[in-house]
């Protein structure tokens, strides 16, 4: 029987900021509750010369009205114990999207190929998660090759999510399009 | 709803060529793999090879490596085999199906959509 | 490559009557990568269970698929007649994928 509760969840063994570095393309996605990118998500890491961590998003997200905007998300990452476990400040360019903090750990990486990303936001009392969010990246916009997505697949079921993921369309939505000259 | 919608059947002459093709609706195209699989007249499912739309990788089972070249054209959502110097054992009905990438968690790569099949006739 | 055998290749069973099929493969196959097809003659093969024992959409509750390792099952618990096909095993768990070369069902 697996264990769901967040506690037991293995993230990546001495997580290396800088070789994570770079631009990751969304491929997969299991939502939280709410507000959320939808697809041609793609994101940007990179390390300062004190070694934080940042990063930057780009996404569509449809809003209540039902309007789709391509948002720009900003997010910077305090470390923690564990150097693949991060608090997570997040924030949009403009106004009107989301900001908040969440956890931000790297379930698993080899930096160059794949990555899992997962964040709890809300424990039940038990110690499972619920309300969860998880992304699979890839550096190629593409497609992860087979072999990773075993890897990736593995993981997505000891993070108890195996079900839940979404294939994230890239179809060049945001190309050049941002909040700011959507509105 | 999803589709796979391939071309009519073929009669060609041993030593030649035929390029069949499946077309797919109702789905992003480039995020899901395109398998090809044969069917003998009353014999099982061969596997062929696949393909990755998104990237134009592709994979051949070592049977089918020099038979069979697949391609996709992303601009109009269509996957291609060409079968090149045939002979009365390539005479099959050949599907494409599609499946997911593992990483979409469901399916396990299972073929979830098939096309309707292609006869190919090989006679002199 | 892993070669994949049914047993039996052809069989009958009687309306109403419990149906279990094999399929046993000559190397380990992890769970999640073994599925299984019907196909009716004139038709195109149908995903009828993913990762040995989930059903796919549409697929009565009578069927269930079971089993690990090398050795994996289809069992109809009663028989009906729109369930006289064949049916394959297939292993996405390494390349070349394989099928299985079927068992016939046949109404008695």
């Known amino acids: 029987e697996r264990d769901c509760r967040v506690s037991s969840f293995r993230v990546k063994e001495n997580f290396d900021k800088a070789r994570f570095s770079g631009t990751w393309y969304a491929m997969a996605k299991k939502d939280p509750e709410g507000l959320f990118l939808q697809d041609n998500i793609v994101a940007e890491f990179s390390v300062d010369e004190t070694g934080q961590m940042s990063a930057t998003a780009k996404g569509r997200v449809r809003l209540l009205n039902n309007w789709d905007v391509c948002a720009d998300m900003v997010g910077t990452f305090t470390d923690t114990e564990d150097p693949a476990k991060f608090k997570m400040k997040y924030w949009g360019v403009a106004s009107f999207l989301q900001k908040g903090n969440d956890d931000h750990w790297i379930v698993d990486t080899d930096y160059d190929t794949y990555a899992v990303q997962y964040s709890c936001r809300l424990l039940n009392l038990d110690g499972t998660c619920a309300d969860s969010y998880s992304f699979v990246f890839s550096r190629d916009p593409n497609g992860l090759p087979p072999e990773a997505q075993k890897i990736v697949r593995q993981r997505q079921e000891e993070l108890c999510l195996a079900r839940q993921y979404r294939l994230i369309v890239h179809n060049g939505y945001c190309d050049g399009r941002s909040e700011r000259n959507l509105l | 709803q999803v589709q796979l919608q391939q071309s009519g059947p073929e009669l060609v002459k041993p030593g030649a060529s035929v390029k069949i093709s499946c077309k797919a609706s109702?789905?992003?195209?480039?995020?899901?793999?395109i398998h090809w699989v044969k069917q003998r007249p009353g014999q099982g499912l061969e596997w062929i090879g696949w393909?990755?739309?998104?990237?134009?990788?592709?994979e051949y089972s070592e049977m089918f490596k020099d038979k069979a070249t697949l391609t996709a054209d992303t601009s109009s959502s269509t996957a291609y085999m060409q079968l090149s110097s045939l002979t009365s054992e390539d005479s099959a009905v050949y599907f494409c199906?599609?499946?997911?990438?593992?990483?979409?968690?469901?399916?396990?790569?299972?073929?979830?959509?098939w096309g309707q099949g292609t006869s190919v006739t090989v006679s002199a | 490559q892993i070669v994949l055998t049914h047993s039996p290749p052809i069989m009958s069973a009687s309306l109403g009557e419990r149906v279990t099929m094999t399929c046993t493969a000559n190397?380990?196959?992890?769970?999640?990568?073994l599925h299984w097809y019907q196909q009716k003659p004139g038709s195109s093969p149908k995903l009828w269970i993913y990762?040995?024992?989930n059903l796919a959409s549409g697929v009565p509750a009578r069927f269930s698929g079971s089993g690990s390792g090398t050795s994996y099952s289809l069992t109809i618990t009663s028989m009906e007649a729109e369930d006289a096909a064949t049916y394959y095993c297939h292993q996405y768990h390494r390349s070349p994928l394989t099928f299985g070369a079927g068992t016939k069902l046949e109404i008695k």
């Open positions: 109702g789905y992003s195209f480039t995020r899901y793999y």
């Open positions: 393909i990755f739309p998104g990237s134009g990788n592709t």
């Open positions: 990762s040995t024992s």
């Open positions: 190397s380990s196959v992890n769970s999640s990568y």
């Open positions: 199906a599609r499946s997911p990438p593992l990483y979409f968690g469901n399916y396990e790569g299972a073929m979830d959509y």
